[in-house]
Interface confidence: low
Amino acid sequence: SERCDDWGLDTMRQIQVFEDEPARIKCPLFEHFLKFNYSTAHSAGLTLIWYWTRQDRDLEEPINFRLPENRISKEKDVLWFRPTLLNDTGNYTCMLRNTTYCSKVAFPLEVVQKDSCFNSPMKLPVHKLYIEYGIQRITCPNVDGYFPSSVKPTITWYMGCYKIQNFNNVIPEGMNLSFLIALISNNGNYTCVVTYPENGRTFHLTRTLTVKVVGSPKNAVPPVIHSPNDHVVYEKEPGEELLIPCTVYFSFLMDSRNEVWWTIDGKKPDDITIDVTINESISHSRTEDETRTQILSIKKVTSEDLKRSYVCHARSAKGEVAKAAKVKQKVPAPRYTVELACGFGAT
């Protein structure tokens, strides 16, 4: 067959769908690879062809669009399953072609089983809610396009295994779930089950997401440097190891890049000749406030090193701060024999 631009297997789009539920899968060509949409392609006389490779097989097969009740169908650039079966798992290819042009891409589709409490191998999106921030909502995701706007689905929300009814601060509002005041106790997996009728059949869409309650922007502050501080002096003799921790607290801020770095005499450690190592550790609170510790280490410090300026810097979306460590050379202990001898000899 003639050459075809093959985009390969697009593993970035590992699509997971639940067994026995409808699934609509758009051909990724138009979304990620080509600079034109399906309508343009169709009006230019290009045809979209679908085929697949079953799990653990190498043979490409055409998709059977003649199953009872049109279980699998194609509509424009969408492949429909009404509903999916477990053995629909495989790699699916959509190919756009005419006599002079051909482009194709494959993507993995995994049909996943869930238990009665909605547990499954499905990768769950995470939705962050601010703690004690007033009313916040999550929306049942990825249900657009499954039914026309005139069809009114019923939506049932669950937290874990339990239907959300008469919860103190969580109220189902159709496609939305409202949290009146989000608390740590609201952390968990939330599932919406959307039930809608179509051609005399009833279909269910199950969507689970993880809610994580995080620090509120109302409480957010610029970074706080706990160490170094004015109370601790790093007093070393030449030849000893110098260890200075920089410990910084960052309030949770959505999409903020938290940074910590050291400067030595105003330069980054990489830009100077001293043998310095920096080790970083990060810990999080329950509301995803972050504590970063960067330990600056000089194995064998020299008297020159002990005269340098060591400054810890921190930056977040809330601001930038810096704090110098108090480093000094330890005064040598008195050599008593010499001093005493001198003392007596002064008579």
């Epitope: 706007s149 005139s150 069809v151 009114k152 929300w157 509002e173 496609m175 005399g200």
Partner: antibody
Framework: EVQLEESGGDLVQPGGSLRLSCAAS?????????MCWVRQAPGKGLEWVSC?????????YYASWAKGRFTISRDNSKNTLYLQMNSLRAEDTAVYFC???????????WGQGTLVTVSS | DIVMTQSPSSLSASVGDRVTITCQAS??????LAWFQQKPGQAPKLLIY???TLASGVPSRFSGSGSGTEFTLTISSLQPEDFATYYC????????????FGGGTKVVIK
């Protein structure tokens, strides 16, 4: 011609019951997503009562005040919509319209209405 | 329940005037809003659905806009046959489907 025609309106005593019908002609119920009832008290505005999905599941929706007293149903073979009204009150006095909804065109087809009077 | 607040409740206008009627939903209803015209003794007639789509056979002087909670019906140049009462209908497509009409706006001759 595509049309809806209500019937069954009458004078009824408070606490009584009544069943309204709405016959569709010129189209099949199954081509309509929803069949609904709307009422209008004399000299007042429109008030939604209930809707039923035309597919086999027959999902029903009610205004909160109508739940428990009013029941919507349909007979696809007769192309007819019903509204069973129980425990009627004076404030239920109104013209009752049936309306159909297709493809997101909310209430694109209406009947002429039937008058229900609740009075002793 | 969802509440649709329509304003004004009545307005007087002349032929050729531009008329604007607003409707506010107590909840986010996306674009699930329709506008109707009703004349005395008649059933309502659908003018606009999905907030801005003109129903079949409706003159182009009628237009709708808005989404979420704020919606507007505009008659660009009022004609004699447009004197009537106008209603908005909001559809709250959530766990239990709720339809609600606005209180109506009566357009009378000035």
């Amino acid at each position: 011609e595509v049309q809806l025609e209500e019937s069954g309106g009458d004078l009824v005593q408070p606490g009584g019951s009544l069943r309204l019908s709405c016959a569709a002609s010129g189209f099949s119920f199954s081509s309509s997503y929803y069949m609904c009832w709307v009422r209008q008290a004399p000299g007042k505005g429109l008030e939604w009562v209930s809707c039923i999905y035309a597919g086999s599941s027959g999902v029903t929706y009610y205004a909160s005040w109508a739940k428990g007293r009013f029941t919507i149903s349909r007979d696809n073979s007769k192309n007819t919509l019903y509204l069973q009204m129980n425990s009627l009150r004076a404030e239920d006095t109104a013209v009752y319209f049936c309306a159909s909804e297709t493809d997101g065109n909310y209430f694109n087809l209406w009947g002429q209405g039937t008058l229900v009077t609740v009075s002793s | 329940d969802i509440v649709m607040t329509q304003s004004p409740s009545s307005l007087s206008a002349s032929v050729g005037d531009r008329v604007t009627i607003t409707c506010q939903a107590s909840e986010d209803i996306y674009s699930n809003l329709a506008w109707f015209q009703q004349k005395p003794g008649q059933a309502p007639k659908l003018l606009i659905y999905r907030a801005s789509t003109l129903a079949s056979g409706v003159p182009s002087r009628f237009s709708g806009s808005g989404s979420g909670t704020e919606f507007t019906l505009t008659i660009s140049s009022l004609q004699p046959e447009d004197f009537a009462t106008y209603y908005c209908l909001g559809v709250y497509t959530y766990s239990t489907d709720i339809h609600a009409f606005g209180g109506g706006t009566k357009v009378v001759i000035k």
